[in-house]
């Protein structure tokens, strides 16, 4: 169960969707992507404190064990729960073509 949407660390500190503007050069894509020339990358950034947006029981267990054994068990990670597709116009051996990538942009986030 996804629970705990209140961030105890303060506003903006916990796992959430953020948008980062990146050029093709930033991404290392300039040699094979023609458009878009700039990407508004939505990604999951932030801490995963106890029970915050826990994706499932495993994440809850991970949180508990991390408190007990921080050197052995890492804290849950902030990752996409789902994705938005995006089309890229790319160079190929046979010319320019379209390719849709289903897992390029994060749609929402959780801790796992």
């Amino acid at each position: 169960a996804r629970n705990g949407d209140h961030c105890p660390l303060g506003p903006g500190a916990c796992c959430a969707l953020h948008t980062v503007r990146a050029s093709l050069e930033d991404l290392g894509w300039a040699d094979w992507v023609l458009s878009p020339r700039e990407v508004q990358v939505t990604m999951c950034i932030g801490a995963c404190p106890s029970q915050f947006r826990a994706a499932n029981m495993h994440a809850q267990i991970k949180t508990s064990l991390h408190r007990l054994k921080p050197d052995t068990v890492p804290a849950p990670c902030c990752v996409p729960a789902s994705y938005n597709p995006m089309v890229l116009i790319q160079k190929t051996d046979t010319g320019v073509s379209l390719q849709t990538y289903d897992d390029l942009l994060a749609k929402d986030c959780h801790c796992i």
Partner: antibody, heavy 117, light 106 residues
Framework: QVTLKESGPGILQPSQTLSLTCSFS??????????VGWIRQPSGKGLEWLAN???????YYNSALKSRLTLSKDTSNNQVFLKISSVDTADTATYFC??????????WGQGTLVTIS | QIVLTQSPAIMSASLGEEITLTCSAS?????MHWYQQKSGTSPKVLIY???NLASGVPSRFSGSGSGTFYSLTISSVEAEDAADYYC?????????FGGGTKLEIK
């Protein structure tokens, strides 16, 4: 495989509203960077861009026609609609819809001929 | 709006001849697309962003240019190249097309 097909009334009288539908398959308007554009071509003449509608529901219109154009979409049914109000004989043309990927009319429909008479 | 002027309006070429079609923009644009439209059919893209050949387009087609002047070259014209050719800019709205060049084969 991407396909698009335009449908319209065929013949219309001056001052009426022209309603066009673009039905498409092979792509989704939920995809970032994807849109559908409308272009028209009077018989024997060149191409004129009319409007684009994008995945995020942004709409852009040809400024010369903007007051007469209305764009909408039904993403779940893969359809885009264009209405042109107060038509006259100058609107007689073949109307194309096309898949737009960022800045590229990548795939076009076969076109539908609309005659204002 | 950016006006695109294509020249010549009509061009007649012999098989195997190299020809160049030009497109002049009223204001500077970053890139230009080129579309081909054969009689009774929908347009299809030939050149994407000034110089990139679209998938499946024969290598005899090429594009170049910058600023306000762009060109499309066919290195060795074939009978199937008889068509109308349009340049297209999207640097600013409204997107515009050139008036077209009709290529006839002698």
């Amino acid at each position: 495989q991407v396909t698009l097909k335009e449908s319209g009334p065929g013949i219309l009288q001056p001052s009426q509203t022209l309603s066009l539908t673009c039905s498409f398959s092979g792509f989704s308007l939920n995809t970032h960077g994807m849109g559908v554009g409308w272009i028209r071509q009077p018989s024997g003449k060149g191409l004129e861009w009319l409007a684009n509608i994008w995945w995020n529901d942004d709409k852009y219109y040809n400024s010369a026609l903007k007051s007469r154009l209305t764009l909408s979409k039904d993403t779940s049914n893969n359809q885009v609609f264009l209405k042109i109000s107060s038509v006259d004989t100058a609107d007689t043309a073949t109307y194309f819809c096309a898949q737009v990927a960022w800045d590229w009319f990548a795939y076009w429909g076969q076109g539908t001929l609309v005659t204002i008479s | 709006q950016i006006v695109l002027t294509q020249s010549p309006a009509i061009m007649s070429a012999s098989l195997g001849e190299e020809i160049t079609l030009t497109c002049s923009a009223s204001s500077s644009v970053r890139y230009m697309h080129w579309y081909q439209q054969k009689s009774g059919t929908s347009p299809k893209v030939l050149i994407y962003s000034t110089s990139n050949l679209a998938s499946g387009v024969p290598s005899r087609f090429s594009g170049s240019g910058s600023g306000t002047f762009y060109s499309l070259t066919i290195s060795s014209v074939e009978a199937e190249d008889a068509a109308d050719y349009y340049c297209h800019q999207w640097s600013s709205y409204p997107w515009t097309f050139g008036g077209g060049t009709k290529l006839e084969i002698k």
